[in-house]
């Protein structure tokens, strides 16, 4: 028996369902009573889900997995993982045994989009050209860790005096806080871009200082 899985990682958004595809080619006359199917975590060999001799033995993984029972006889051994969590990320092995056996691993990459950044200034009044200001760009509940970029109004990257911190919450999602310290010119727009490297999703935030008072551009 030959087992086939997708070579590319499966990308799943947090709280959605994911399908880890796995298939085998049944011989003529194949019946489910002959099938031993095991899904396991590749690294630890911990059982995720199994099907033995015509019987679905159920989920051993948070009760969030299911097979496609009606499709098994056609050689579809895919696994449905419900309400994906950050901790589900990793490699899963599909192990199929009929008379002989074969296995293959598929990777699950979990992702969550970052929120539109909120921008804050300190100090936020009585600003004068030449003042040092701290601009904070905050974006929430994303995964995996973000890449953060700052630019000025002309699109020139600002790399000096940037401090970025990323903290995971109890669900494993990251909150990003990036701080830019900059000396004000007469007028200025400062933009931060928070990029999710897996989703290739960019979240933008900017602040424009035009003398007094400062303004935040409207959301697009």
């Amino acid at each position: 028996v030959e087992v086939q899985v997708s070579e590319d990682p499966v990308v799943a958004l947090v709280d959605t369902d994911a399908t880890l595809r796995c298939s085998f080619s049944p011989e003529p006359g194949f019946s489910l009573a002959q099938l031993n199917l095991i899904w396991q975590l590749t690294d630890t060999k911990q059982l995720v889900h199994s099907f033995t001799e015509g019987r679905d033995q159920g989920s051993a993984y948070s009760n969030r997995t299911a097979l496609f029972p009606d499709l098994l006889v056609q050689g579809n051994a895919s696994l449905r993982l419900q309400r994906v969590r950050v901790t589900d990320e990793g490699s899963y092995t599909c192990f199929v045994s009929i008379q002989d056996f074969d296995s293959a691993a598929v990777s699950l990459q979990v992702a969550a989009p970052y929120s539109k950044p909120s921008m804050t200034l300190e100090p936020n009044k009585d600003l004068r050209p030449g003042n040092m200001v701290t601009i904070t760009c905050s974006s929430y509940q994303g995964y995996p860790e973000a890449e953060v970029f700052w630019k000025d109004g002309q699109g020139v990257p600002l790399t000096g005096n940037v401090t970025t911190s990323q903290m995971a919450n109890e669900r494993g999602l990251f909150d990003v806080h990036s701080v830019l310290r900059v000396v004000l010119g007469a007028n200025g727009t400062y933009s931060c871009l928070v990029r999710n490297p897996v989703l290739q999703q960019d979240a933008h935030g900017s602040v424009t200082i035009t003398g007094q008072p400062l303004t935040f551009p409207p959301e697009a």
Epitope: I38, Q40, G54, R55, G58
Partner: antibody
Framework: QVQLVQSGAEVKKPGESLKISCKAS????????MHWVRQRPGKGLEWIGM????????NYNERFKRKATLTVDKSISTAYLQWSSLKAEDTAMYYC??????????WGQGTLVTVSS | QIVLTQSPSTLSASVGDRVTITCSAS?????MYWYQQKPGKAPKLLIY???NLASGVPIRFSGSGSGTSYTLTISSLQPDDFATYYC?????????FGQGTKLEIK
């Protein structure tokens, strides 16, 4: 005919570890889940976990996850239960059992483990 | 985990009696399994998939039930039947057993 033959009785001191074996014959050892179950004196049956020899896949009862380690040696059709840091309350009969579909249809004769200082 | 509660815990009966042991599950299960255990011996499978007799088991044993309520019945007790009986489920992990019902001679 199917047979599961377990290693002999053990007497251990608290804090010691234990490894008991279960040699299978009369069926294709690689293809069936092997379970381990314990029974303390005068008490009921407690499922420790199971291992599939062919894939090495295992599943533990959360209660015993830090105590028990299940392994197999396919070349000699033998399953092993390793138990760490024994305590007096681990005194029990330990059984291996083969399962088919969803029933444990054949059981070993049991290994009596006594933990005493 | 699914808790299985057997009743009664102890049952006194005579040869020839019809006896019923019940097993109540804390959540619905698909199938129930029944084992017989005699002192100093390993458990022996009696009933699988709720109502199917394991190989070599006399037809005086039968099983029934669904959802959260299952029963093992012995239609006419024989001297060899005095033992402890356990129900077991594999509908969710961990696998669990009932606490046992000891069937003794009245």
């Amino acid at each position: 005919q199917v047979q599961l033959v377990q290693s002999g009785a053990e007497v251990k001191k608290p804090g010691e570890s234990l490894k008991i074996s279960c040699k299978a014959s009369g069926y294709n050892f690689n293809n069936y889940w092997m379970h381990w179950v314990r029974q303390r004196p005068g008490k009921g049956l407690e499922w420790i976990g199971m291992i599939h020899p062919n894939s090495g896949t295992f599943n533990y009862n959360e209660r015993f996850k830090r105590k028990a380690t299940l392994t197999v040696d396919k070349s000699i059709s033998t399953a092993y239960l390793q138990w760490s840091s024994l305590k007096a309350e681990d005194t029990a009969m330990y059984y291996c059992a083969k399962s088919t579909a969803l029933a444990t249809d054949y059981w070993g004769q049991g290994t009596l483990v006594t933990v005493s200082s | 985990q699914i808790v299985l509660t057997q009743s009664p815990s102890t049952l006194s009966a005579s040869v020839g009696d019809r006896v019923t042991i019940t097993c109540s599950a804390s959540s619905s299960v698909s199938y129930m399994y029944w084992y017989q255990q005699k002192p100093g011996k390993a458990p022996k499978l009696l009933i699988y998939d709720t109502s199917n007799l394991a190989s070599g088991v006399p037809i005086r044993f039968s099983g029934s039930g669904s959802g959260t309520s299952y029963t093992l019945t012995i239609s006419s007790l024989q001297p060899d039947d005095f033992a402890t009986y356990y129900c077991q489920q594999w509908s969710s992990y961990p696998l669990t057993f009932g606490q046992g019902t000891k069937l003794e001679i009245k």
